[in-house]
């Protein structure tokens, strides 16, 4: 039975040209994390594997930085970066947990961070 929950940074906004940290945290389970995938809609941004380290997709190499931790930093944001981002935790023995983050990239400097929320 999957008992874990993923806590994410929730709905967040950031300024065009700036950077943002996408962060997820898996709790309430003793399952071992073997890999974390970061995806934007259906596009793979990056993989962090427990044994093999990081792999950043070539098309995002210039604008994505690994970390902090298992998180991901998006840099040089554009309005086109607005949308849904997913952290997909592969675990043993539980299976897969998915967290969702919605990022809005704003033209002006009125970007504010949303509250944290949980996805069971």
């Amino acid at each position: 039975m999957m008992t874990g929950t993923i806590e994410t940074t929730g709905n967040i906004s950031a300024e065009k040209g700036g950077s943002i940290i996408l962060q997820c945290h898996l709790s309430s389970t003793t399952a071992q994390v073997t890999q974390v995938n970061w995806e934007q809609q259906d596009q793979l941004l990056a993989i962090c594997n427990a044994d093999l380290g990081w792999h950043i997709s070539p098309s995002f190499k210039d604008r994505v930085a690994p970390g902090p931790g298992l998180g991901l930093t998006l840099q040089s944001l554009t309005v086109n970066d607005t949308g849904e981002y997913f952290c997909i935790y592969h675990t043993y023995p539980d299976g897969t947990y998915t967290g969702r983050i919605f990022l809005e990239v704003l033209e002006s400097s009125v970007a504010e961070h949303g509250a944290r929320f949980q996805i069971p």
């Epitope: 071992q32 427990a50 044994d51 093999l52 380290g53 043993y92």
Partner: antibody
Framework: EFQLQQSGPELVKPGASVKISCRAS????????MNWVQQTNGKSLEWIGV????????NYNQKFKDKATLTVDHSSSAAYMQLNSLTSEDSAVYFC????????????WGTGTTVTVSS | DIQMTQSPASLSASVGETVTITCRAS??????LAWYQQKQGKSPQLLAY???TLAEGVPSRFSGSGSGTQFSLKINSLQSEDFGIYYC?????????FGGGTKLEIK
């Protein structure tokens, strides 16, 4: 104390195979992955591959994928590396070295095994 | 594969001196860099990881720094036990690769 004790030196003929061992003690064998590293002529180090004892997953450096075969034996908390079709270029010291989960550096190294390929 | 280049290949120094070894990566490895020390006939020993975090038991006279492609290992007030070969290794993503080594000798 964490220890990785490797098997003794090997003198083998060209074309032959050799299997070297790395016995772990002082920690939970399945909690860390085991890497193998080649050192030729006391010079630099080359990563051969890694095996995860808990899941049995293996990843090889492309350069060594047809040369090395990595296995583990849980009952003896040992990791093994078989090297096949040996040539003089495979003469080297081989180290096992462990790494932790999401920690891709080698915090404990084995004692090293010298393999000499000579006719 | 990411290439790691160390310099100098060798250097001589006296006990009490301060030395710096540098390591350059062929592309950004962010802060995923480790340093090892190897004595003649022995196994390498981890000194530092994540560019600047010292491994357990490593004296504070060692310090690592850098990010991206440029890194350095500084040893203050050299002790006789510090002589040997130093290697850098990136730990960003497989395949892990090492620098060619820097041999630190007693002057």
């Amino acid at each position: 104390e964490f220890q990785l004790q490797q098997s003794g030196p090997e003198l083998v003929k060209p074309g032959a195979s050799v299997k070297i061992s790395c016995r772990a003690s002082g920690y939970s064998f399945t909690a860390y992955s085991m890497n193998w590293v080649q050192q030729t002529n006391g010079k630099s180090l080359e990563w051969i591959g890694v095996i995860n004892p808990k899941f049995g997953t293996i990843n090889y450096n492309q350069k060594f994928k047809d040369k090395a075969t990595l296995t583990v034996d849980h009952s003896s908390s040992a990791a093994y590396m078989q090297l096949n079709s040996l040539t003089s270029e495979d003469s080297a010291v081989y180290f096992c070295a462990r790494n932790g989960n999401f920690a891709w550096y080698f915090d404990v190294w084995g004692t090293g095994t010298t393999v000499t390929v000579s006719s | 594969d990411i290439q790691m280049t160390q310099s100098p290949a060798s250097l001589s120094a006296s006990v009490g001196e301060t030395v710096t070894i540098t390591c350059r990566a062929s592309e950004s490895i962010f802060s995923y860099l480790a340093w090892y020390q190897q004595k003649q006939g022995k196994s390498p020993q981890l000194l530092a990881y994540n560019a600047e975090t010292l491994a357990e038991g490593v004296p504070s006279r060692f310090s690592g720094s850098g990010s991206g492609t440029q890194f350095s290992l500084k040893i203050n007030s050299l002790q006789s036990e510090d002589f040997g070969i130093y290697y850098c290794q990136h730990h960003f993503g497989v395949p892990w690769t090492f620098g060619g080594g820097t041999k630190l000798e007693i002057k």
